[in-house]
Interface confidence: medium
Amino acid sequence: AGVFELQIHSFGPGPGPGAPRSPCSARLPCRLFFRVCLKPGLSEEAAESPCALGAALSARGPVYTEQPGAPAPDLPLPDGLLQVPFRDAWPGTFSFIIETWREELGDQIGGPAWSLLARVAGRRRLAAGGPWARDIQRAGAWELRFSYRARCEPPAVGTACTRLCRPRSAPSRCGPGLRPCAPLEDECEAPLVCRAGCSPEHGFCEQPGECRCLEGWTGPLCTVPVSTSSCLSPRGPSSATTGCLVPGPGPCDGNPCANGGSCSETPRSFECTCPRGFYGLRCEVSGVTCADGPCFNGGLCVGGADPDSAYICHCPPGFQGSNCEKRVDRCSLQPCRNGGLCLDLGHALRCRCRAGFAGPRCEHDLDDCAGRACANGGTCVEGGGAHRCSCALGFGGRDCRERADPCAARPCAHGGRCYAHFSGLVCACAPGYMGARCEFPVHPDGASALPAAPPGLRPGDPQRYL
């Protein structure tokens, strides 16, 4: 067990042209807050997959009001760290998503309004117990500077927080079975703590949080007897003639799910669907609050008004469920007409129209170029009874009205994965690379290989280059 810690250093306009407008104004004062989502491994998972390692929400930052005519500065940040506790081993490699949210404090009916300003993502290698690692990521015209680390919570130690230590019983040395716990010279390696609820009779562990079953038992907590292969029915009664181990009741018999959770059988055991406010294998853990970051996929968490709903997730378009964990298949409604191909981009629906059709839902029938104009500097080309537009760079679609897919040019270097986003694009870098476009290799010592420093700048200072 341990904690992943994230320190946001600055959020503001990135270098170069096209500085963003300030997100706040005298008419609409606002403040920022951040959300971090962690996933184990160097996963190629889509942005909406669950934050399996955990998530956290920062406090709100100071209220900021833009000075008229002033460029957008680095915006005032919330105090403190974002902390994501992890219960099991630290995986060593992880993927992250950091979202910057704006809370508008104007006179909106129904309270403050929230909007996502920027989202950055990346994949990193990180040993627990190591020093802070610094990083810089860009999302469109915004730039986010931050540091992160993973640390073990006692009694766990080691680069994966898998070794457990406890104070020595004798001043001189550990017992023969308990190894010294470097670097804690006065502590000794201690037994593992298995997954909560793991049957002490039928389960054991060789990794923290694990529950391995002794022979004849199965299920996540090793509480379900297994029938032998000679049993005809997996639920059949115990019999000396069939040679079956007593299989006992079905995994959902007696409903093992607490706090109103509903049980469904799985091929090997059971699964509990928990009501809001509860989680865990058997819905036994309660008291989830917004501080636990329970809302996925950019959902916004609001504290519930009554004890039975400790939080409420306001889901962005395209997601639903009590934790915004379910993706809505809006294309199933077949919104694109005339055989258009429907694309659900998460934040918006898009229709890719067949030749001869155009419009947001492919509702316009286009015969030729007569009276037709291609937007944004595009030129009309006739052919085959239909027209098409040859669009200027950066635009696409039937009438050049759509911005081109920012990922089409493969902007992420070194095998980085590109995610299109309404604020621009996000590169999720392959292991060993960092930077807004994954252009910099990361050396094992954590320094990045940067271009030679211009005169007057120190080499090895990533903030000055990215």
């Epitope: 201690a190 037994p191 593992l192 703590v193 054991f204 562990c205 022979e215």
Partner: antibody, heavy 120, light 112 residues
Framework: QVELVESGGGLVQPGGSLRLSCAAS????????MSWVRQAPGKGLEWVAA????????YYADSVKGRFTISRDNSKNTLYLQMNSLRAEDTAVYYC?????????????WGQGTLVTVSS | DIVMTQSPDSLAVSLGERATINCKSS????????????LAWYQQKPGQPPKLLIY???TRESGVPDRFSGSGSGTDFTLTISSLQAEDVAVYYC????????FGQGTRLEIK
């Protein structure tokens, strides 16, 4: 039915070597930590050494550290104890024993034992 | 090492009577992280290997008669045989498996 059968015991001179084997059957050998426990004639039980399920971690009593080596071959379902620099006080019945799970679990099955006698 | 001390060294009890064996460890075998006592009880009859009776200080091994029970926590533990049977004559050992592994010296149980 869990069965553990020790072999390799016998008479050996002080300073000599012996290798004990334990053939396991009736369970998934590769899932369990294993130990060697000995019992001198007319005396109590003394734990000697242990090894985790995949052989990656070994543990020894101070009295045998540096002289005995525990190992296992999961493909052969066999546990070994290599005993070097034997002393008279190593004379005992040596039991092969299965843990209920990993190292930090009680032993639940024992073999019948093999007698090692160290004498000149 | 953790030293395990059993008392008494030998015990004679009438058939059908209660037998109690005590075991004291030189330091606690309760692991605070999971609140388990890493202590087991074994029975050994002449010419046979030991047999597991109790683990986690109080959990009876499958197939062990319910007249055997274990209790205690930290450093003081007890094995109780509620109604002694003739087949219970044996040497009983307590065993800690938290810090390395050590056994008590054994308690010989006989019929009075």
């Amino acid at each position: 039915q869990v069965e553990l059968v020790e072999s390799g015991g016998g008479l050996v001179q002080p300073g000599g070597s012996l290798r004990l084997s334990c053939a396991a059957s009736g369970f998934t050998f590769s899932s369990y930590a294993m130990s060697w426990v000995r019992q001198a004639p007319g005396k109590g039980l003394e734990w000697v050494a242990a090894i985790n399920s995949n052989g990656g971690n070994t543990y020894y009593a101070d009295s045998v550290k540096g002289r005995f080596t525990i190992s296992r071959d999961n493909s052969k379902n066999t546990l070994y104890l290599q005993m070097n620099s034997l002393r008279a006080e190593d004379t005992a019945v040596y039991y092969c024993a299965r843990h209920r799970g990993g190292f930090y679990y009680a032993v639940d099955y024992w073999g019948q034992g093999t007698l090692v006698t160290v004498s000149s | 090492d953790i030293v395990m001390t059993q008392s008494p060294d030998s015990l004679a009890v009438s058939l059908g009577e209660r037998a109690t064996i005590n075991c004291k460890s030189s330091q606690s075998v309760l692991y605070s992280s999971n609140q388990k006592n890493y202590l087991a009880w074994y029975q050994q009859k002449p010419g046979q290997p030991p047999k597991l009776l109790i683990y986690w200080a109080s959990t009876r091994e499958s197939g062990v008669p319910d007249r055997f029970s274990g209790s205690g926590s930290g450093t003081d533990f007890t094995l109780t045989i509620s109604s002694l049977q003739a087949e219970d004559v044996a040497v009983y050992y307590c065993h800690q498996y938290l810090s390395s592994r050590t056994f008590g010296q054994g308690t010989r149980l006989e019929i009075k």
